[in-house]
């Protein structure tokens, strides 16, 4: 018998083809050149090679490109992706977009692993921001990215970017998160006309202060309850029930569905129980009549 | 997951025929390429022949012109029909898939089918 480490008479791989799959795991690792492999990476994408070849190849590669693989080898990875660990990972430089973009395809329909999170890591970082290109890229394969980042990484989010944002992208987000974001959507929109403009605004308005709801307010934008429930409970209190009443306009009726829900339940408390009969909807709770409201938390910080 | 059955084994005389099949189930849709193996007593398990998910196959040198492989797409089997058998042909003939799933590949196997060629 032929010993497992030579390359048997006639089998030396003069390139990478499909009559290599019938090759055993010992013949493929004694007859095909790593460097021959390298070169013809577009080519392994092509060919249905065995979970066990696949270790394989992986492990050629490996032991060629021990720094980590250079991008010419990586666009072409296709299954081979789904062989790596994130520490293999971390030694690439991955700069073409087009690289991403092939390796996320590999991925696609399935929950964000550990290795494609480290992959878009070490592009991001190699890019310095999140462009737009980018981040329509990624959005595209995994709309609940946006929301994935922290506060902090989101703060490299140039506002042009914002424009590739759906509102389903900011699904998952948290208020930590949509305060980041949203001060970069109203620079991004602020050319937009009114209805327009609350249009693109709308998913972010999470992240929005008092001030910007009160003059969304004068705008007659009929926001639906949905987008009222996520605002800030400390940007809602200080609205009166004029402004609440003219923000969602016909969606008013809404607040009684919700009035044991906060931010409705904390701003009801906060409201005239008069003021809040004009409404007609029964919302109860209110400061009854002839109760005087001292704002505490302003005295102390006179104070 | 995906679950592999393999069926149509059997007794056969050299020079007769047997079509064996592997019914998937599970996972289905992410399955790329389907192989068959076979594992001859004493012997390691070698590659049979493949179908790739666009229809392209191929069997190894062995059992070129002998053996072919064909998929009922519809009902998610796959088959190996072999003709003009030989008593090396005698083996264990097992189905095998990989997916991808959670960010990694994973390898499935059927149970395996038993071919026995007599001369």
């Known amino acids: 018998e032929v010993e497992k480490t030579a390359c048997p008479s006639g089998k030396k791989a003069r390139e990478i083809d499909e009559s290599l799959i019938f090759y055993k795991k010992w013949e493929l690792e004694a007859c095909v050149d790593a460097a021959l492999l390298a070169t013809q990476m577009d080519r392994v994408n092509a060919i249905p090679f065995t979970y066990e070849q696949l270790d394989v190849l992986k492990h050629k590669l490996d032991e060629l490109y021990p720094q980590g693989y250079p991008e010419s080898v990586i666009q072409h990875l296709g299954y081979l992706f789904l062989k790596m660990s994130p520490e293999d990972i971390r030694k690439w430089n991955v700069t073409s977009l087009e690289t991403l973009k092939a390796l996320l395809e590999v991925n696609k329909g399935h929950e964000m692993s550990p290795q494609v999170a480290t992959l878009i890591d070490r592009f991001v970082k190699g890019r310095g921001q999140l462009d737009k290109d980018t981040l329509d890229t990624l959005t595209a394969f995994y709309p609940g990215y946006l929301c994935s980042l922290s506060p902090e990484e989101l703060s490299s989010v140039p506002p042009s970017s914002i424009w590739a944002v759906r509102p389903q992208d900011l699904d998952t987000c948290d208020p930590r998160q949509l305060d980041v974001l949203y001060p970069k959507a109203r620079l991004a929109f602020q050319n937009m006309n009114g209805s327009e403009y609350f249009v693109k605004i709308q998913s972010f308005l999470g992240g929005a202060p008092t001030e910007d709801l009160k003059a969304l307010s004068q705008q007659n934008v009929s926001m639906d309850l949905a987008t009222f429930m996520k605002l800030r409970t400390d940007a809602v209190l200080p609205l009166t029930v004029a402004e609440v009443q003219k923000l969602l306009g016909p969606h008013v009726e809404g607040l009684k569905a919700e009035e044991r829900h906060r931010p409705v339940r904390d701003w009801i408390l906060r409201q005239r129980q008069d003021d809040l009969d004009t409404l007609g909807l029964g919302l109860q709770g209110g400061i009854p009549n002839g109760y005087l409201v001292l704002d505490l938390s302003m005295q102390e910080a006179l104070s | 997951q995906v679950q592999l059955v393999e069926s149509g084994g059997g007794l056969v005389q050299a020079g007769g025929s047997l079509r064996l099949s592997c019914a998937a189930s599970?996972?289905?849709?992410?399955?790329?390429?389907m192989y068959w193996y076979r594992q001859a007593p004493g012997k390691e398990r070698e590659l049979v022949a493949f179908?790739?998910?666009?229809?392209?196959?191929n069997v190894r040198d062995s059992v070129k012109g002998r053996f072919s492989v064909s998929r009922d797409s519809a009902k998610n089997i796959v088959y190996l029909q072999m003709n003009s058998l030989k008593p090396e042909d005698t083996a264990v003939y097992y189905c095998?898939?990989?997916?991808?799933?959670?960010?990694?590949?994973?390898?499935?196997w059927g149970q395996g089918t038993q071919v026995t060629v007599s001369s």
């Open positions: 095998n898939t990989y997916i991808p799933y959670g960010g990694t590949l994973h390898d499935f």
């Open positions: 599970g996972s289905t849709s992410s399955i790329n390429t």
């Open positions: 179908i790739s998910s666009g229809g392209s196959t």
